[in-house]
């Protein structure tokens, strides 16, 4: 039975050219996290594997940095970075938990952070 919940940074906005931290946190479970995948739509951005550490997909290496923690930092943002991001927690014995973050990259400097919310 999957008892855990993923808390994410929710809907967030950031300024073009700036950077943003995508963060997820798995709670309410004692399951072991074996790997966390970060994906943008159908593209794999990065993997944090318990044994191997971080792997950043080659096409994102110059704009994506690992961390903090199991989070991901996106740099040199462009409007094309607007969209859905997913953190996928592979755990044992629970299975897979997925969190969703929507990022909007704004042209102006009115970007503000959205509220946090939980995905069961």
């Amino acid at each position: 039975m999957m008892t855990g919940t993923i808390e994410t940074t929710g809907n967030i906005s950031a300024e073009k050219g700036g950077s943003i931290i995508l963060q997820c946190h798995l709670s309410s479970t004692t399951a072991q996290v074996t790997q966390v995948n970060w994906e943008q739509q159908d593209q794999l951005l990065a993997i944090c594997n318990a044994d191997l550490g971080w792997h950043i997909s080659p096409s994102f290496k110059d704009r994506v940095a690992p961390g903090p923690g199991l989070g991901l930092t996106l740099q040199s943002l462009t409007v094309n970075d607007t969209g859905e991001y997913f953190c996928i927690y592979h755990t044992y014995p629970d299975g897979t938990y997925t969190g969703r973050i929507f990022l909007e990259v704004l042209e102006s400097s009115v970007a503000e952070h959205g509220a946090r919310f939980q995905i069961p």
Epitope: T34, N49, H90
Partner: antibody, heavy 124, light 108 residues
């Protein structure tokens, strides 16, 4: 701390059998893929066999197919390699190794954690 | 079976110098390539995977590059503990998973 401890090696005659064991500790054994990799004296590395976390799927190198069987007992945190019809060319140090992947993530078939190895000598 | 060929078989380098090791695959393995270091009497140690990603705890002086059939492991400034045998390994998503014959890096 991840630890893998092989045992069961020794001297066996050609055509004989041997069962190697690998006792795992320091991690949750159940979900992880495991492999056996061998190294003949003074030679390079050769992947031998692999098994999924559940034990439902196994893979073997052509050189040992039909003679060697990989298995696991997740309740005992132990990996096995049953070796039958042994040949002189099977003489090697046999390492067990932990895959970073699970049934959930998929398997990598690379290995960060290895045991210290157990020597199998096939000779008359 | 994909055949992995490493060159040179032996590389003589002075401490502090750069070492460049090559690995060639008989057919494309994309970026599914790992590098290991092995010292006498020890198990192999994973250095690099996905052709260029350092495994956890591996010093920055080790770097990997290449894709397809041609790969390189570079040790930017050899330390005394780096003298060892280095193996490349391909892990395309179906067996067998094959290793190169190894390159021995020795003190010049």
């Amino acid at each position: 701390e991840v630890q893998l401890l092989e045992s069961g090696g020794g001297l066996v005659q050609p055509g004989g059998s041997l069962r190697l064991s690998c006792a795992a500790s320091g991690f949750t054994f159940g979900p992880y893929g495991m492999s056996w990799v061998r190294q003949a004296p003074g030679k390079g590395l050769e992947w031998v066999s692999a098994i999924s976390g559940s034990g439902a799927s196994t893979w073997h190198a052509d050189s040992v197919k039909g003679r060697f069987t990989i298995s696991r007992d997740n309740s005992k945190n132990t990996l096995y390699l049953q070796m039958n019809s042994l040949r002189a060319e099977d003489t090697a140090v046999y390492y067990c190794a932990k895959d970073p992947g699970t049934d959930s993530t998929g398997y990598y078939y690379i290995w960060r954690y290895w045991g210290q190895g157990t020597l199998v000598t096939v000779s008359s | 079976e994909i055949v992995m060929t490493q060159s040179p078989a032996t590389l003589s380098v002075s401490p502090g110098e750069r070492a460049t090791l090559s690995c060639r695959a008989s057919q494309s393995v994309s970026s599914n390539l790992a590098w290991y270091q092995q010292k006498p009497g020890q198990a192999p140690r994973l250095l690099i995977y996905s052709a260029s990603t350092r495994a956890t705890g591996i010093p920055a002086r080790f770097s990997g590059s290449g894709s397809g059939t041609e790969f390189t492991l570079t040790i930017s400034s050899l330390q005394s503990e780096d003298f060892a045998v280095y193996y490349c390994q391909q892990y395309v998503p179906h067996p067998p998973f094959t290793f190169g014959g190894g390159t021995k890096v020795e003190i010049k």
